[in-house]
């Protein structure tokens, strides 16, 4: 079990380093200072990392690897890793401009035990913690991940960087510094401190290696006060207690001369009350402070290390696994631990909620809810079951007017209306030819029960969609075989859409022939011959007239002339509305005068009665 103290600690402070170090002093510390995180410049930048309703806060994870190999953050962070504290809670203000987001306090510090490699790769992740009323506690999600490769000498100044991840921008600084007694650009040389700190004047560091003095002179930052400043790294200026400023020339306070401790102020002549180095206990996490001649030293409790015991060397005893994860290993400080995460969570500390809804387990448009311990599907109306897989009878009690049929599906009843009707319940009259449904030059005929398409030769289908020979002759030949220019062209209706008119002797079939000749006084007719129950696709001798542009035989689209649109050139022709057992073979004497003159794609109204049983619309 995790003690209340420790569990509170884990939720507020640095939580883990993925490579766990023993409680020996590290050779040095990589420090990362996040300056800002927010929407980047340019369009499409996000307004806020929080959802509109829930407050959230940010935290950061840094992963360091030696060399110049950028790798996934999940692979070992061989130089170390650290997690920041949680930042202040942020709630999006509707309408407010997108701000730079409130950040966690303090540095991210990654101690390294061995030599600083000089070249390293970093990965910095920005995480969002949503603080709503989710079941199972807060939800974590990765907002941005930036990575880079850098050369960096230990002991150098802060390096500034700006990285962009998608629409987010992260500004930060970083440096590597050695922890005494290590010195040098790789923190590999060791010096033993003497009783007094170095003064910046002569520039020689008064510390010796374990055998002899460190050879290289140490030059502090130019202008560093020789009385109140000292340095441990080249170019540095660190102040004695009671002094501040970039060159250690500003006393911390001049309001009191009561304290006997501290250097004399040049301006007031009284002693500046320099607080003792252990005042306020700078050692975090229960560390005990002891003063040294130069500063202070923290003795850290088990599981923590660093100058101020601020870095957590987490083991299973510290309860590092979130969300009910099972911790394995890590019994001694030198060994890492592994979290075995429960369903719905992942990450080295089970801190990442798995988006199991991304697999779209809910069928039929159901809404997926990941509750952490389980998935739930909120089904649309008309569906039920754990995954909304059961289609309820949404047509029950629903009526579709005018011969429409109710179609189940989609959670709401839908009427498939009979031709000539539309609307939700098929109560609205519709002009079936208005949408120009007949393709490839087919003529649309509207009648009381819907429409029929009269296809141009060489086309089939209820809407003339299928060219019989798509690689055949190109559009609009001068005259099809067997016809002279100026002769009417013949169109054959799909047989199932034919119109048979019963008249005369019982069993005899009559065919309505619409002979249309615009601008001509003579009429053509039709002699009808019986045929097989369904027509061959080569029913007409002049079926080579495809009345279309070349469809193309390759891949992709090939545009065709829109023969459903009124054209300026209107070929004259005979429209044969046939029954399944009748073919038009040749033109002979007229039966009927023309009924209507129209253009391709326009509706032609049949202005005569006929029994509905004869019309079949597939």
């Amino acid at each position: 079990m995790v003690s209340p103290r420790m569990s509170g600690l884990l939720s507020q402070t640095v939580i883990l380093a993925l490579i766990f170090l023993p409680q020996t002093r590290p050779a040095g510390v990589f420090e990362l200072q996040i300056h800002s995180f927010g929407p980047g410049p340019g369009p499409g930048a996000p307004r806020s990392p929080c959802s509109a309703r829930l407050p959230c806060r940010l935290f950061f994870r840094v992963c360091l690897k030696p060399g110049l190999s950028e790798e996934a953050a999940e692979s070992p962070c061989a130089l170390g890793a650290a997690l920041s504290a949680r930042g202040p809670v942020y709630t999006e203000q509707p309408g407010a401009p997108a701000p730079d987001l409130p950040l966690p306090d303090g540095l991210l510090q990654v101690p390294f035990r061995d030599a600083w490699p000089g070249t390293f790769s970093f990965i910095i992740e920005t995480w969002r913690e949503e603080l709503g009323d989710q079941i199972g506690g807060p939800a974590w999600s990765l907002l941005a991940r930036v990575a880079g490769r850098r050369r960096l000498a230990a002991g150098g100044p802060w390096a500034r960087d700006i990285q962009r991840a998608g629409a987010w921008e992260l500004r930060f600084s970083y440096r590597a510094r050695c922890e005494p007694p290590a010195v040098g650009t790789a923190c590999t040389r060791l010096c033993r401190p003497r009783s007094a700190p170095s003064r910046c004047g002569p520039g020689l560091r008064p510390c010796a290696p374990l055998e002899d003095e460190c050879e290289a002179p140490l030059v502090c930052r130019a202008g560093c006060s020789p009385e109140h400043g000292f340095c441990e790294q080249p170019g540095e200026c660190r102040c004695l207690e009671g002094w501040t400023g970039p060159l250690c020339t500003v006393p911390v306070s001049t309001s009191s001369c009561l304290s006997p401790r501290g250097p004399s102020s040049a301006t007031t002549g009284c002693l500046v009350p320099g607080p003792g180095p252990c005042d306020g206990n700078p050692c975090a996490n229960g560390g005990s402070c002891s003063e040294t001649p130069r500063s202070f030293e923290c003795t850290c409790p088990r599981g923590f290390y660093g100058l101020r015991c601020e870095v957590s060397g987490v083991t299973c005893a510290d309860g590092p696994c979130f969300n009910g994860g099972l911790c394995v290993g890590g019994a001694d400080p030198d060994s890492a631990y592994i979290c075995h995460c429960p369903p719905g969570f992942q990450g080295s500390n089970c801190e990442k909620r798995v988006d199991r809804c991304s697999l779209q387990p809910c069928r039929n448009g159901g809404l997926c809810l990941d509750l952490g311990h389980a998935l739930r599907c909120r089904c649309r109306a008309g569906f039920a079951g754990p995954r909304c897989e059961h289609d309820l009878d949404d047509c029950a009690g629903r009526a579709c007017a005018n011969g429409g049929t109710c179609v189940e599906g989609g959670g709401a009843h839908r009427c498939s209306c009979a031709l000539g009707f539309g609307g939700r319940d098929c109560r609205e009259r519709a002009d079936p030819c208005a949408a120009r449904p007949c393709a490839h030059g087919g003529r649309c005929y509207a009648h009381f029960s819907g429409l029929v398409c009269a296809c141009a030769p060489g086309y089939m289908g209820a809407r003339c969609e299928f060219p019989v020979h798509p690689d055949g002759a190109s559009a609009l030949p001068a005259a099809p075989p067997g016809l002279r220019p100026g002769d009417p062209q013949r169109y054959l209706l799909p047989p199932a859409l034919g119109l048979l008119v019963a008249a005369g002797v019982a069993g005899a079939a009559l065919l309505l022939v619409h002979v249309r000749r615009r601008g001509h006084s003579q009429d053509a007719g039709s002699r009808l011959l019986a045929g097989t129950p369904e027509p061959s696709v080569h029913a007409l001798p002049d079926a080579l007239n495809n009345l279309r542009t070349q469809e193309g035989s390759g891949d992709g689209p090939s545009s065709s002339v829109d023969w459903n649109r009124p054209e300026d050139v209107d070929p004259q022709g005979i429209y044969v509305i046939s029954a399944p057992s009748i073919y038009a073979r040749e033109v002979a004497t007229p039966l009927f005068p023309p009924l209507h003159t129209g253009r391709a794609g326009q509706r032609q109204h049949l202005l005569f009665p006929y029994p509905s049983s004869i019309l079949s619309v597939k």
Epitope: R436, G461, A462, R463, A496, P557, S558, N564, K618
Partner: nanobody
Framework: EVQLVESGGGLVQPGGSLTLSCVAS????????MGWYRRAPGKQRELVAG???????VYSDSVKGRFTISRDNAKNSVYLQMNSLRAEDTAVYYC?????????????WGQGTLVTVSS
């Protein structure tokens, strides 16, 4: 742009069966027709079977009674069940997609899948 991907072709003995599948993706439309065409060696491409958006079907005389076309609108797919296959059915079979959007018509073809009927 509509992409068509056919599958199911292969080598089959006379009298055997195959099912071809075609999936349309991209800018598909509800007002469409889908079908199967074939091109035998040395011949031009010809319609085998087609099915309109309302389910109406057409077949060529040579396959009537042996082939069955069907479609799954939810999956934007069309299928051709081929039974009692003959040597003369050997051809490259192409999926066809015809759509009409706002009065503009467009035809699309797949790459083709080879069906070989041989003993």
């Amino acid at each position: 742009e509509v992409q068509l991907v056919e599958s199911g072709g292969g080598l089959v003995q006379p009298g055997g069966s195959l099912t071809l599948s075609c999936v349309a993706s991209g800018s598909t439309s509800s007002r469409n027709a889908m079908g199967w065409y074939r091109r035998a060696p040395g011949k031009q491409r010809e319609l085998v079977a087609g099915i309109s958006s309302n389910g109406s079907k057409v077949y060529s005389d040579s396959v009537k009674g042996r082939f069955t076309i069907s479609r799954d609108n939810a999956k934007n797919s069309v299928y051709l069940q081929m039974n009692s296959l003959r040597a003369e059915d050997t051809a490259v079979y192409y999926c066809y997609y015809f759509r009409t959007v706002s009065g503009s018509s467009m035809s699309y073809w797949g790459q083709g899948t080879l069906v070989t009927v041989s003993s």
